[in-house]
């Protein structure tokens, strides 16, 4: 058993049918010695008396808010949560496996630049009685500071018969140098509590591996005289690290017809302009990627050919 | 990225072209190592990230773009002295900091070159003959060093009398390649920045 926060405790259980469970001793936080009784949740049934209560915690029915009283007055509370260990592996019932970029990906994180700011998000089908708490650091043995905000509900989607909820959090490394070469990964830890179930999820990454630039901005077309060709130009996104000559991007320019089946023409360039043939009803899209370290491509910025 | 790329002319700055070749070569070598050594811990998540140049050179600090010198988190400076003549500088007026930067890059390359050559000698003794260092990568390191053209003491190749532990050598190769790729990215950024300025 360990303390998650004041008066909230997590009991770790080896979870299998007929498991013996864990013996837990609760102590009433009071100078009183006599006349103390214990109850669980809203029930008035007295579970025991005395300054300490010994219980065998086996299932969720044994978890909840234990309260010690004296003469009708509440003395203190202890909330017991359960953390299930199923055949050596902690349960992952609360969050959805996003399966990207690999199986067992519960937390996904992205950064728009090298400033040390990043966003993480996760999915769940649970709509109520759910709380999250996020902590982060650079490295784990001698951790350096990363400050995270509160997790917020950022999107709701309908998936088949189920509703899916997306939560996200923004974090900022306290003293980040955009040019630094990372040798210790960022660690992100999310505590999730659903009713009386506790779970924790972690992700470990280097900022350089989660970079996804914003799409190029100010995408414009300039027709070339007496030609079907156009000059496409764009700019680095505002959110990208500066100076741009140091944090350089490379670009992919795509000409896509109305039909998805039509052949796509693609050009790769390090410049912020390109000359392409603009077909009728086609659109031109440009996306960006770090020129030197191949992390994710940005989303596409698009303009119609007409 | 095995894709058609419209690359800009490296122009006045001869080192830019060599640094781009270096990044390409080390990335290819790392990819080959990850595929060949699939049963070894060779991914970024599995290895310890070690920097053999730590406390010996200070490339990131010495090559910091002017715009980032206002960022206190970037000024984690370490006192290091360097030799300051190099042919990449020949065509332009240059500051002491730029010379310091390029000589730091040169020292990095020299250190990695020694490590890779020592390691290759061990890998050649492996009866499995599983993996060797790409000669192209070693050649590219050499070319960039020549383009930087700093006078520097030659570091003798380390020789070892004991029987090499091939498992450890292959894991060390992965660690070195990961670190060298990160340094090659920094070198490329620096060369691009210097070329633009």
């Amino acid at each position: 058993i360990w303390e998650l926060k004041k008066d909230v405790y997590v009991v770790e259980l080896d979870w299998y049918p007929d498991a013996p469970g864990e013996m837990v001793v609760l102590t009433c936080d009071t100078p009183e010695e006599d006349g103390i009784t214990w109850t669980l949740d809203q029930s008035s049934e007295v579970l025991g008396s005395g300054k300490t209560l010994t219980i065998q915690v086996k299932e969720f029915g044994d978890a909840g808010q234990y309260t010690c009283h004296k003469g009708g007055e509440v003395l203190s509370h202890s909330l017991l949560l359960l953390h299930k260990k199923e055949d050596g592996i902690w349960s992952t019932d609360i969050l959805k496996d996003q399966k990207e970029p690999k199986n067992k990906t519960f937390l996904r994180c992205e950064a728009k630049n090298y400033s040390g700011r990043f966003t993480c998000w996760w999915l769940t089908t649970i709509s109520t009685d759910l709380t999250f708490s996020v902590k982060s650091s650079r490295g784990s043995s001698d951790p350096q500071g990363v400050t995270c905000g509160a997790a917020t509900l950022s999107a709701e989607r309908v998936r088949g018969d189920n509703k899916e909820y997306e939560y996200s959090v923004e974090c900022q490394e306290d003293s980040a140098c955009p040019a630094a070469e990372e040798s210790l990964p960022i660690e992100v830890m999310v505590d999730a509590v659903h009713k009386l179930k506790y779970e924790n999820y972690t992700s470990s990454f280097f900022i350089r591996d989660i970079i996804k630039p914003d799409p190029p901005k100010n995408l414009q077309l300039k027709p070339l005289k007496n030609s079907r060709q156009v000059e496409v130009s764009w700019e680095y996104p505002d959110t990208w690290s500066t100076p741009h000559s140091y944090f350089s991007l490379t670009f992919c320019v795509q000409v896509q017809g109305k039909s998805k089946r039509e052949k796509k023409d693609r050009v790769f360039t390090d410049k912020t302009s390109a000359t392409v043939i603009c077909r009728k009803n086609a659109s031109i899209s440009v996306r960006a990627q770090d020129r030197y370290y191949s992390s994710s491509w940005s989303e596409w910025a698009s303009v119609p050919c007409s | 990225r095995n894709l058609p790329v419209a690359t800009p002319d490296p122009g006045m700055f001869p080192c830019l072209h060599h640094s781009q070749n270096l990044l390409r070569a080390v990335s290819n070598m790392l990819q080959k190592a990850r595929q060949t050594l699939e049963f070894y811990p060779c991914t970024s998540e599995e290895i310890d990230h070690e920097d053999i140049t730590k406390d010996k050179t200070s490339t990131v600090e010495a090559c910091l773009p002017l715009e980032l010198t206002k960022n206190e988190s970037c000024l984690n400076s370490r006192e290091t002295s360097f030799i300051t003549n190099g042919s990449c500088l020949a065509s332009r007026k240059t500051s002491f900091m730029m010379a310091l930067c390029l000589s730091s890059i040169y020292e990095d390359l020299k250190m990695y070159q020694v490590e890779f050559k020592t390691m290759n000698a061990k890998l050649l003794m492996d009866p499995k003959r599983q993996i060797f260092l790409d000669q192209n990568m070693l050649a590219v390191i050499d070319e960039l060093m020549q383009a930087l053209n700093f006078n520097s003491e030659t570091v003798p190749q380390k020789s070892s009398l004991e029987e090499p532990d091939f498992y450890k050598t292959k894991i060390k190769l992965c660690i070195l390649l990961h670190a060298f790729r990160i340094r090659a990215v920094t070198i490329d950024r620096v060369m691009s920045y210097l070329n633009a300025s």
Epitope: W15, Y16, P17, D18, E59, E86, D87, I89 | F39
Partner: antibody
Framework: QVQLVQSGGGVVQPGRSLRLSCAAS????????MHWVRQAPGKGLEWVAF????????YYADSVKGRFTISRDNSKNTLYLQMKSLRAEDTAVYYC????????WGQGTMVTVSS | SYVLTQPPSVSGTPGQRVTISCSGG????????VKWYQQLPGTAPKLLIY???QRPSGVPDRFSGSKSGTSASLAITGVQAEDEADYYC????????????FGTGTKVTVLG
């Protein structure tokens, strides 16, 4: 005390369907994940499928994906395996099993796919 | 498609020490715990070892398990006639959990 009693096995022609059941007693069935495991005659153990305690997630071996469906009825304390498009290579003893460090197995039920 | 490899058979005379190996990789045994099962002819498998080296109550102490790196082993110290059976190791793969990964199985024969 924990008991898993299996039923539903038998002889079936290739391409036909069969549903296996596993009735649980002696524990809170709705709190635990469950597996199906099979063993072809004279061969080793092969995992078939898994279902979460609440039925929210299901996982299958590649060899049965798209043909077999694992399900559970927590109100009846019963686990099911619906098997469609059966093949000769599905011939095996099928076991249900609880998920956890200490597990309990059903007695097994024989499924024979033969023309 | 077994990823955990066991020797097909091992044998010993009563009282001898018999060991069965189970060889895997970094993503399975290297990252997860190992179980061992005993299966007597015509019966369901019986759990012998869980969490690499733990014995459930009721399992004789002549059975012991161990794990090192990407391999595990089961030892029967002082093998007895009633130990003649098939033995299977089981683990998970970190990418496909909760799918069970079973070993290829080992037939233990007690001679004489």
């Amino acid at each position: 005390q924990v008991q898993l009693v299996q039923s539903g096995g038998g002889v079936v022609q290739p391409g036909r369907s069969l549903r296996l059941s596993c009735a649980a007693s002696g524990f809170t069935f709705s709190s635990y994940g469950m597996h199906w495991v099979r063993q072809a005659p004279g061969k080793g153990l092969e995992w078939v499928a898994f279902i979460r305690y609440d039925g929210s997630n299901k996982y299958y071996a590649d060899s049965v994906k798209g043909r077999f469906t694992i399900s559970r009825d927590n109100s009846k304390n019963t686990l099911y395996l619906q098997m469609k498009s059966l093949r000769a290579e599905d011939t095996a003893v099928y076991y249900c099993k609880t998920h956890g460090s200490h597990d309990n197995w059903g007695q097994g039920t024989m499924v024979t796919v033969s023309s | 498609s077994y990823v955990l490899t066991q020797p097909p058979s091992v044998s010993g005379t009563p009282g001898q020490r018999v060991t069965i190996s189970c060889s895997g990789g970094r993503s399975n045994i290297g990252s997860n715990t190992v179980k061992w099962y005993q299966q007597l002819p015509g019966t369901a498998p019986k759990l012998l070892i869980y969490y690499n080296d733990q014995r459930p109550s009721g399992v004789p102490d002549r059975f012991s398990g161990s794990k090192s790196g990407t391999s595990a082993s089961l030892a029967i110290t002082g093998v007895q006639a009633e130990d003649e059976a098939d033995y299977y190791c089981q683990s998970y793969d970190r990418g496909t959990h909760p799918a069970l990964l079973f070993g290829t199985g080992t037939k233990v024969t007690v001679l004489g």
